[in-house]
């Protein structure tokens, strides 16, 4: 069961539903972006492979004071089996490459859409 708490989900939902809603939230962010997202903050790039949800959260959690991605952070925490806190890094980060949050979101969105189309929900 995927359980995304807080403002994200009313309770446990199927993995496909959770992924669908995460994709829609990322679409929301990209569509509604006017000024530079999170004031142009930079985050570590990640390898979009197994364990990427935790890696994505570890990267984005270091961005503070950016309301636009708070819901995404909460939703990603529902996909990550362990608690993630700022300053925590896994081997999935490409530690020599930082990119803007806006680009990070676009890359993540493209990859998640591909997974969704291919039926890879877990």
């Amino acid at each position: 069961l995927t359980c995304l708490g807080g403002f994200a989900s009313p309770g446990p939902v199927p993995p496909s539903t959770a992924l669908r809603e995460l994709i829609e939230e990322l679409v929301n962010i990209t569509q509604n972006q006017k000024a530079p997202l999170c004031n142009g903050s930079m985050v570590w790039s990640i390898n979009l492979t197994a364990g990427m949800y935790c890696a994505a959260l570890e990267s984005l959690i270091n961005v503070s004071g950016c309301s636009a991605i708070e819901k995404t952070q909460r939703m990603l925490s529902g996909f990550c089996p362990h608690k993630v806190s700022a300053g925590q890094f896994s081997s999935l980060h490409v530690r020599d490459t930082k990119i803007e949050v806006a680009q990070f979101v676009k890359d993540l969105l493209l990859h998640l859409k591909k997974l969704f189309r291919e039926g890879q929900f877990n």
């Epitope: 009313p10 939902v13 199927p14 496909s16 809603e21 679409v27 969704f116 929900f121």
Partner: antibody, heavy 118, light 107 residues
Framework: EVQLQESGPGLVKPSETLSLTCTVS????????WNWIRQPPGKGLEYIGY???????YYNPSLKSRVTISRDTSKNQFSLKLSSVTAADTAVYYC????????????WGQGTTVTVSS | DIQMTQSPSSLSASVGDRVTITCHAS??????LSWYQQKPGKAPKLLIY???DLHTGVPSRFSGSGSGTDFTLTISSLQPEDFATYYC?????????FGGGTKVEIK
């Protein structure tokens, strides 16, 4: 109360494109997920795909190469186009709503019958 | 795709009978199963979601159970308006798929 109403031609020639529209009243297509489902005569239900409140789409891989779902927010409508139709596409076509964070269809249109024949 | 198999495909019953319909999923779908009722010439209507949760306005004679791969829809005391075809649907993964239907006829 949200209501859905399908409309479109009841007869389409083989190899042509089937075009249907679903009009949503009592709610906005800028929330939730808006789906198409079909039912061939005397058979079960087949999921076609959705368009989301953001305009994002998903299509059943079995039909993906032929399907387009689009929307017109100013008219509160969403549409289905199915190209290169054959007799196997003859069915009752339903539009249905799926609310955010859910995976079941709680509101359906009454359905419209489309026959593919020359 | 996840295949949904319903049994029986049809059954005959009398008013007041207890009726049971089963739905089998080709893989584990946890509790992500819904049931619909369809009458001739009408759209399906949602009865049950999450395997056992009754949709708003659905009479309590309808109940659902099961998890994993095997599910059951039960009508405790069949009423004249219950003669219809019933479909199950999985929400575990896209594309969503439906069972082939069970037609409940008057004996």
């Amino acid at each position: 109360e949200v209501q859905l109403q399908e409309s479109g031609p009841g007869l389409v020639k083989p190899s042509e494109t089937l075009s249907l529209t679903c009009t949503v009243s009592g709610g906005s297509i800028s929330s939730d997920y808006w789906n198409w489902i079909r039912q061939p005569p005397g058979k079960g239900l087949e999921y076609i795909g959705y368009i989301s409140y953001n305009g994002n789409t998903y299509y059943n891989p079995s039909l993906k190469s032929r399907v387009t779902i689009s929307r017109d927010t100013s008219k509160n409508q969403f549409s289905l186009k199915l190209s290169s139709v054959t007799a196997a596409d003859t069915a009752v076509y339903y539009c249905a709503r799926l609310a955010k964070w859910t995976w079941y269809f709680d509101i359906w249109g009454q359905g419209t019958t489309v026959t593919v024949s020359s | 795709d996840i295949q949904m198999t319903q049994s029986p495909s049809s059954l005959s019953a009398s008013v007041g009978d207890r009726v049971t319909i089963t739905c089998h999923a080709s893989q584990n779908i946890n509790v992500w199963l819904s049931w619909y009722q369809q009458k001739p010439g009408k759209a399906p209507k949602l009865l049950i979601y999450k395997a056992s949760d009754l949709h708003t306005g659905v009479p309590s004679r309808f109940s659902g159970s099961g998890s994993g791969t095997d599910f059951t829809l039960t009508i405790s005391s069949l009423q004249p308006e219950d003669f219809a075809t019933y479909y199950c649907q999985q929400g575990q993964s896209y594309p969503y798929t439906f069972g082939g239907g069970t037609k409940v006829e008057i004996k």
